[in-house]
Interface confidence: low
């Protein structure tokens, strides 16, 4: 399927609107510090060039690869060296090294100001004045803050963003209509970014075959009626889509994702009975819907797994003939029977099975050796089950905020070298898993909880990778795709940690805390809690609770005072002194 001009091919396939949006996302994800106007200018230049290629595919430069065209365009930015430093060196390289170089300089935690939401009327005016610029700005701001955001999905978010403004800016109570929708988009967007971050990290760190294993397990759970060959085809296509998006090839990625959605809908009879509604939707909604579709019912008459994978005398023969295919079939058969297991657990079981066959197929009596392999699965299954049971009990007892605090203390004691903002961000997210997953019945808890935990612990890994400070975090993040969570769970208190010097400034608060939202106030308190644990890692739960209760009472008292600032100054000193005494700092 060779095209004379790749850029013309993608422009025609995607249409001008999607083409421009995707090029803007690509550029903003690469050059995260560049002003909006500069990006718009670059996108317009690329779009005009693409149109000349559509008119005549033989025109000059139209035969160049997209990486060459986009890279050349990025390298025209005059301030590249002063804004991005050594990233400018990428421009001296040839493709494909140049694109690899740009990818390596993507910053998961860019130094950008927090997005502040303007007044509703201000936003509605901006939306009405120039809808196109308003929506482009949304794409730009999200893309530069989330350099691995799944680009075709960001188009879907932008469509919903536009719909929210179109509806709510005409409503009687604009704020009541708009703000909940924007909150929902923000929260879903963060979750979507984190999920895609894990996919890209898996591809990057562990390779395509590891990603394929993940996809076999997930798609087999979702489409248990589909044949193995069908699942394999979907896995291959899905891997291509995500490899492209994670590699910055956003036009190809969006195009291939649309093709995959089309294929799935044309073949839904042999894939899943749950796809009908999704397949009636327009393209962006359709792709999103398929990605989120519920698991189909399991076929009623599935035979026991033991016959083919333990009982048969041909196990070693089948394994030796085509290892990947045989293990893939094992994973497919196991996953379709176990929608109640997390994907990472299924991969652990497959790994155990693989290791056993490697050992046993070289033994004198292979069958005798691997006959009990399924018994080895029991502890692997029980570990996440017990962990989830304990943590959901704790969550139900404490509620989200206090559950987050318990996790903050737990993780700060495990890895106290990690920066306080990272510990707060990650522990808050881990705590939200409680709200999201503990409400589910037992059969849905593990896939919800453990796969969510994998996503948020990957966030910790990605943030830590930027400035590594803890060997224990590095170990849990790099040793294995599927054992990251158990590795973190198994960490005990870090006895080698030298407590941080006490700094009164860290615990000095001002009247501005009173005007913060409930969420921001919680973050302030949780930041203080992490700092306390870093000063006093041996503090007991009771000691920490007492100090935090005093702190909450102090904030409440001073926020009610007439002279708030004086109250914070004077009462704050007393609180610090009392806390030092309580914790023996």
């Amino acid at each position: 399927d060779a095209h004379k001009s790749e850029v013309a091919h993608r422009f025609k396939d995607l249409g001008e609107e999607n083409f421009k949006a995707l090029v803007l996302i690509a550029f903003a994800q690469y050059l995260q510090q560049c002003p909006f106007e500069d990006h718009v200018k670059l996108v317009n230049e690329v779009t005009e060039f693409a149109k000349t290629c559509v008119a005549d595919e033989s025109a000059e430069n139209c035969d160049k690869s997209l990486h060459t065209l986009f890279g050349d365009k990025l390298c025209t930015v005059a301030t590249l060296r002063e804004t991005y430093g050594e990233m400018a060196d990428c421009c001296a390289k040839q493709e494909p090294e140049r694109n690899e170089c740009f990818l390596q300089h993507k910053d998961d935690n860019p130094n950008l100001p927090r997005l502040v939401r303007p007044e509703v009327d201000v936003m509605c005016t901006a939306f009405h004045d120039n809808e196109e610029t308003f929506l482009k700005k949304y794409l730009y701001e999200i893309a530069r803050r989330h350099p691995y955001f799944y680009a075709p999905e960001l188009l879907f978010f932008a469509k919903r963003y536009k719909a929210a403004f179109t509806e709510c800016c005409q409503a009687a109570d604009k704020a009541a209509c708009l703000l909940p929708k924007l909150d929902e988009l923000r929260d879903e967007g963060k979750a979507s970014s984190a999920k895609q971050g894990l996919k890209c990290a898996s591809l990057q760190k562990f390779g395509e075959r590891a990603f394929k294993a993940w996809a076999v397990a997930r798609l087999s759970q979702r489409f248990p009626k589909a044949e193995f060959a069908e699942v394999s085809k979907l896995v291959t296509d899905l891997t291509k889509v995500h490899t492209e998006c994670c590699h910055g090839d956003l036009l190809e990625c969006a195009d291939d994702r649309a093709d995959l959605a089309k294929y799935i809908c044309e073949n839904q009879d042999s894939i899943s009975s749950k796809l009908k509604e999704c397949c009636e939707k327009p393209l962006l909604e359709k792709s999103h819907c398929i990605a989120e579709v519920e698991n189909d019912e399991m076929p009623a008459d599935l035979p026991s797994l033991a016959a083919d994978f333990v009982g048969s005398k041909d196990v070693c023969k089948n394994y030796a003939e085509a290892k990947d295919v045989f293990l893939g079939m094992f994973l497919y058969e196991y996953a379709r029977r176990h929608p109640d297991y997390s994907v990472v657990l299924l991969l652990r079981l497959a790994k155990t099975y693989e290791t056993t066959l490697e050992k046993c197929c070289a033994a004198a009596d292979p069958h005798e050796c691997y006959a009990k392999v399924f018994d080895e699965f029991k502890p692997l299954v029980e570990e996440p089950q017990n962990l989830i049971k304990q943590n959901c009990e704790l969550f139900e007892q404490l509620g989200e905020y206090k559950f987050q605090n318990a996790l903050l203390v737990r993780y700060t004691k495990k890895v106290p070298q990690v920066s306080t903002p990272t510990l707060v961000e990650v522990s808050r997210n881990l705590g939200k898993v409680g709200s999201k997953c503990c409400k589910h019945p037992e059969a849905k808890r593990m896939p919800c909880a453990e796969d969510c935990l994998s996503v948020f612990l990957n966030q910790l890994c990605v943030l830590h990778e930027k400035t590594p400070v803890s060997d224990r975090v590095t170990k849990c993040c790099t040793e294995s795709l599927v054992n990251g969570r158990p590795c973190f769970s198994a960490l005990e208190v870090d006895e080698t940690y030298v407590p941080k010097e006490f700094n009164a400034e860290t615990f000095t608060f001002h009247a501005d805390i009173c005007t913060l939202s409930e969420k921001e106030r919680q973050i302030k308190k949780q930041t203080a809690l992490v700092e306390l644990v870093k000063h006093k890692p041996k503090a007991t739960k009771e000691q920490l609770k007492a100090v935090m209760d005093d702190f909450a009472a102090f904030v409440e008292k001073c926020c009610k005072a007439d002279d708030k600032e004086t109250c914070f100054a004077e009462e704050g000193k007393k609180l610090v002194a009392a806390s030092q005494a309580a914790l023996g700092l």
């Epitope: 760190k205 390779g207 075959r209 590891a210 290791t355 490697e358 795709l481």
Partner: nanobody, 123 residues
């Protein structure tokens, strides 16, 4: 079919350097982790070094750490081992090995071996 062909071995004096190459064919090279394993005369197999599919993760046996460097060129389907400061105890048959561990976690799974290239370190 899968083929791994090593080259670059030979006779070298202690303290000198050698670079081994392994040309891979018959499979998608960049999907697999690769390793070097050696066997000294009359001894068992000894793992030397491994490299992940994209070169991000590299590990060495303690006996060669700081002296040997493993690398790969996925565009050329080639694996390399740069051996510096060679010693008599590095004398061995060096094998290029494919790692088929599907999930690239934990222990490697060696499923295809080359014929080996002989390195002799002697004055």
């Amino acid at each position: 079919e899968v083929q791994l062909v090593e080259s670059g071995g030979g006779l070298v004096q202690p303290g000198r350097s050698l670079r081994l190459s392994c040309a891979a064919s018959g499979f998608t090279f960049h999907h697999y982790a690769m390793h070097w394993v050696r066997q000294a005369p009359g001894k068992g197999l000894e793992w030397v070094s491994g490299i992940s599919w994209n070169g991000n993760k590299i590990t060495y046996a303690d006996s060669v750490k700081g002296r040997f460097t493993i690398s790969r060129d996925n565009a050329k389907n080639s694996l390399y081992l740069q051996m510096n400061s060679l010693r008599a105890e590095d004398t061995a048959l060096y094998y290029c090995v494919r790692d088929s561990s599907l999930f690239i976690v934990g222990a490697p799974t060696f499923d295809h071996w080359g014929q080996g290239t002989l390195v002799t370190v002697s004055s």
